[in-house]
């Protein structure tokens, strides 16, 4: 079992090294910045989003409230690429968690304040599901300055 876990860890490590998680980071940062912008708006002003999908609200992908966000070509492309990258971890939930942790660590310095960090974490947890993938059951996304014992 120990040998198998060692092999699994090595496989995961090489997978993580090959992965390009930047699109996930870009997608999430854009998403939380967009959300902050929309929270800052007057809720009663009828602003029309020029990029919002012109389709029935109930015509949606399974697994998610609104995974295919067409609010901007760059944004949806980041999401598409991110989902493709995460799909490579679909058969290894432990490694999927490692990938999510890596995204969290890479962006932690750019998050301003506790509220933005919590929001980023929340979106990050939802990310696999938004891609139509299984989310890891237990995945600690806390970032500690002194590093973290992951398992």
């Amino acid at each position: 079992r120990q040998q198998w876990e060692l092999q699994g860890d090595r496989r995961c490590q090489s997978q993580l090294e090959r992965a390009n998680l930047r699109p996930c980071e870009q997608h999430l940062m854009q998403k939380i910045q967009r959300d902050e912008d929309s929270y800052g708006r007057d809720p009663y002003s009828p602003s029309q989003d020029p990029y919002s999908p012109s389709q029935d609200p109930d015509r949606r992908d399974p697994y998610s409230p609104s995974p295919y966000d067409r609010r901007g070509a760059g944004s949806s492309q980041h999401q598409e690429r991110c989902c493709n990258e995460l799909n490579e971890f679909e058969n290894n939930q432990r490694c999927m968690c490692e990938a999510l942790q890596q995204i969290m660590e890479n962006q932690s310095d750019r998050l301003q304040g506790r509220q933005q960090e919590q929001q980023f974490k929340r979106e990050l947890r939802n990310l696999p599901q938004q891609c139509g993938l299984r989310a890891p059951q237990r995945c600690d996304l806390e970032v500690e300055s002194g590093g973290r014992d992951r398992y």
């Epitope: 949606r60 690429r81 493709n84």
Partner: antibody, heavy 113, light 102 residues
Framework: ESGPGLVKPSETLSLTCTVS????????WSWIRQPAGKGLEWVGR???????TYNPSLKSRVTMSVDMSKNQISLNLSSVTAADTAVYYC????????????WGQGTTVTVSS | QSPSSVSASVGDRVTITCRAS??????LAWYQQKPGKAPKLLIY???SLQSGVPSRFSGSGSGTDFTLTISSLQPEDFATYYC?????????FGQGTKVEIK
């Protein structure tokens, strides 16, 4: 897609799909074929890290590869027979929505001596 | 996929069905193909309209039974339509439905 239009039986069919404009990075790329007057058959797909998934019916004969520097995806099909005569398409294959949203124009391959 | 062909006139409502051999959730896409051309994605995840596709095309269904509807057939819609499951590998396509001019 590009490659020789005529391949002899028992030889290897080699096709290349060159993606213009956007980078192929972080996308899956599928190969699909269609014999004249028939339906579509999925051959397999490759991710830009090189990981592949092949159709079991062709697995023993198929090899796919990717060249990020040239923005190219390649398909090799060995030991071809007349049954491999078809139009071959490459398509961008998305995890989000599990759809093939961008297709190449296709290239006709005839297997004949 | 049924029917294998359908004859219709411009302005008609056309319905094509696709039945999966097992539950595929909503992982179904629809493509349109014209002679000598590559397939074009119309609908994905059973009911989501691909960007740039006219709203006269719609999809519905989940599990094993799916439908593609063209609400008012236009001259450019005469083509062959394929469904494709994205639930598992290998990806598989329906045998196609040819929409012909009556």
């Amino acid at each position: 897609e590009s490659g020789p239009g005529l391949v002899k039986p028992s030889e290897t069919l080699s096709l290349t799909c060159t993606v213009s404009g956007d980078s192929i990075r972080s996308y899956y790329w599928s190969w699909i074929r269609q014999p004249a007057g028939k339906g579509l058959e999925w051959v397999g797909r490759i991710f830009t890290t090189g990981s592949t998934t092949y159709n079991p019916s062709l697995k023993s004969r198929v090899t796919m590869s990717v060249d990020m520097s040239k923005n190219q995806i390649s398909l090799n099909l060995s030991s071809v027979t007349a049954a491999d005569t078809a139009v071959y398409y490459c398509a961008r294959d998305q995890t989000l929505g599990r759809r093939m949203d961008v297709w190449g124009q296709g290239t006709t391959v005839t297997v004949s001596s | 996929q049924s029917p294998s062909s359908v004859s219709a006139s411009v302005g008609d409502r056309v319905t094509i069905t696709c039945r999966a051999s097992q539950d595929i959730s909503s992982w179904l896409a629809w493509y349109q193909q014209k002679p000598g051309k590559a397939p074009k994605l119309l609908i994905y995840t059973a009911s989501s309209l691909q960007s740039g596709v006219p709203s006269r095309f719609s999809g519905s269904g989940s599990g094993t039974d799916f439908t593609l509807t063209i609400s008012s057939l236009q001259p450019e819609d005469f083509a062959t339509y394929y469904c494709q499951q994205g639930n598992s590998f290998p990806r598989t396509f329906g045998q196609g439905t040819k929409v012909e001019i009556k």
